[in-house]
Amino acid sequence: KFSKQSWGLENEALIVRCPRQGKPSYTVDWYYSQTNKSIPTQERNRVFASGQLLKFLPAAVADSGIYTCIVRSPTFNRTGYANVTIYKKQSDCNVPDYLMYSTVSGSEKNSKIYCPTIDLYNWTAPLEWFKNCQALQGSRYRAHKSFLVIDNVMTEDAGDYTCKFIHNENGANYSVTATRSFTVKDEQGFSLFPVIGAPAQNEIKEVEIGKNANLTCSACFGKGTQFLAAVLWQLNGTKITDFGEPRIQQEEGQNQSFSNGLACLDMVLRIADVKEEDLLLQYDCLALNLHGLRRHTVRLSRKNPIDHHS
């Protein structure tokens, strides 16, 4: 539970998060377990600790080992372990299994491949994408935010995909690569006018003031992976990004699920620390594809804290 495997390539940046979480005010000390030597916090060091993060800029094969993070509150020290392995770069194109992140799958029309671990890094778009070491070119491939979109997916698109990006630390740039397998599910699909499964039209969602709340916009668009299908949230008719309330955020990236063979998308709206003024807003779940757009409206109402059990 409080031990995590991490890996990277020599001469690339690697950033590891302490698996033991604490309050933001708590300090975190990092040690190299084999020698019990403290990891420095000064950024001039190649390997240094920065709060919850341990940074290898860049990593070396000799950095491999178990690192201990100790999260300290005024009265308690709690320990986590990061098992780090740094590998030599392969001279050939083959990416060994031990460097692969989890496999993702898609089908026909389009698919998304997310770049693993990228949220830990300070990077700027665009990402570079490679398949079997070849740079991806052509209109079917689009690098968008932290994922690759492949239009009109074919069985030949299966393979190992590598994302490459630059991590910036105090003006210095470091390369990072991450690879995962992509498999293609062969299925015939069709497209329908969007059907919103949740929320119900004009639903009233009860929330507790001061607590976090999640609203899920879920819609289905037909069978098989869909082309130009999306779900999103609007606040008072305005895009979330344009609304300007940092407490209210859409989940980055849409979750794709296949329910009873149907292609469905979810988008979670996360409201942190619900305030009275949030009850006055109109929350619109929008689902759209080539057939058109459907909208369901939700409003929030206050409820008293009720019991629930983990």
């Epitope: 539970k1 409080f2 979480q21 604490g22 309050k23 509150s73 009265t75 308690f76 709690r78 320990t79 507790e208 001061g210 607590k211 976090n212 620390d273 619900v274 804290p305 009720i306 019991d307 629930h308 059990h309 983990s310």
Partner: antibody
Framework: EVQLLESGGGLVQPGGSLRLSCAAS????????MIWVRQAPGKGLEWVSY????????YYADSVKGRFTISRDNSKNTLYLQMNSLRAEDTAVYYC????????????????WGQGTLVTVSS | EIVLTQSPATLSLSPGERATLSCRAS??????LAWYQQKPGQAPRLLIY???NRATGIPARFSGSGSGTDFTLTISSLEPEDFAVYYC????????FGQGTKVEIK
């Protein structure tokens, strides 16, 4: 110095209600989760209820779910336990305790406890 | 609900002897386990957290070990003030306590 002081216990008939309070001092009350634990006479400890630092997250033991309500007033540094539909088996010393680490909705140890207040449910 | 079973129910020992208390969980709790000491008429006192870490101010004669489902509290040499009831507590999934082990003077 951290201090927790429970009050509100007493004798109540079955089916009756009681409200326990726990006055906290010596720490930033709103930073920490708080928990009620009870101990029946001559018995062991039983967790009753949990509330997160901002009051937004609450959990209950199955034995009290639907009857007890935990709440807090961070402006008054006070924790509450509203107990309704009391039964004989609710007879116990009730302790409030601090969970000093808990991020909202998670659990840790109880590092400071009050001295307890006795609740007796009897006809 | 995770059930914690402590053994033995009672431990009769003399001052200076070593006490070994056991706590077994019905499923893995990783290292999310604590030990408390309770004396008559008093609230429990935290001794050990995260299975093996001593809480602030706890003497070195108290030590904890174990991970997963099997845990041990050891008192290396019993002092007169150590005779009390000891409880284990898991916090991996909500909170549950063991039924307690009474350490009494032989």
């Amino acid at each position: 110095e951290v201090q927790l002081l429970e009050s509100g216990g007493g004798l109540v008939q079955p089916g009756g209600s009681l409200r326990l309070s726990c006055a906290a001092s010596g720490f930033t009350f709103s930073d920490d989760a708080m928990i009620w634990v009870r101990q029946a006479p001559g018995k062991g400890l039983e967790w009753v209820s949990y509330i997160g630092g901002n009051g937004g997250t609450t959990y209950y033991a199955d034995s009290v779910k639907g009857r007890f309500t935990i709440s807090r007033d961070n402006s008054k540094n006070t924790l509450y336990l509203q107990m309704n539909s009391l039964r004989a088996e609710d007879t116990a010393v009730y302790y409030c305790a601090r969970d000093p680490w808990s991020t909202e909705g998670s659990f840790f140890v109880l590092d400071y406890w009050g001295q307890g207040t006795l609740v007796t449910v009897s006809s | 609900e995770i059930v914690l079973t402590q053994s033995p129910a009672t431990l009769s020992l003399s001052p200076g002897e070593r006490a070994t208390l056991s706590c077994r969980a019905s499923q893995s709790v990783d290292d999310d386990l604590a030990w408390y000491q309770q004396k008559p008429g008093q609230a429990p006192r935290l001794l050990i957290y995260d299975a093996s870490n001593r809480a602030t101010g706890i003497p070195a004669r108290f030590s904890g070990s174990g991970s997963g489902t099997d845990f041990t509290l050891t008192i290396s040499s019993l002092e007169p003030e150590d005779f009390a009831v000891y409880y284990c507590q898991q916090y991996n999934d909500a909170i549950t306590f063991g039924q307690g082990t009474k350490v009494e003077i032989k």
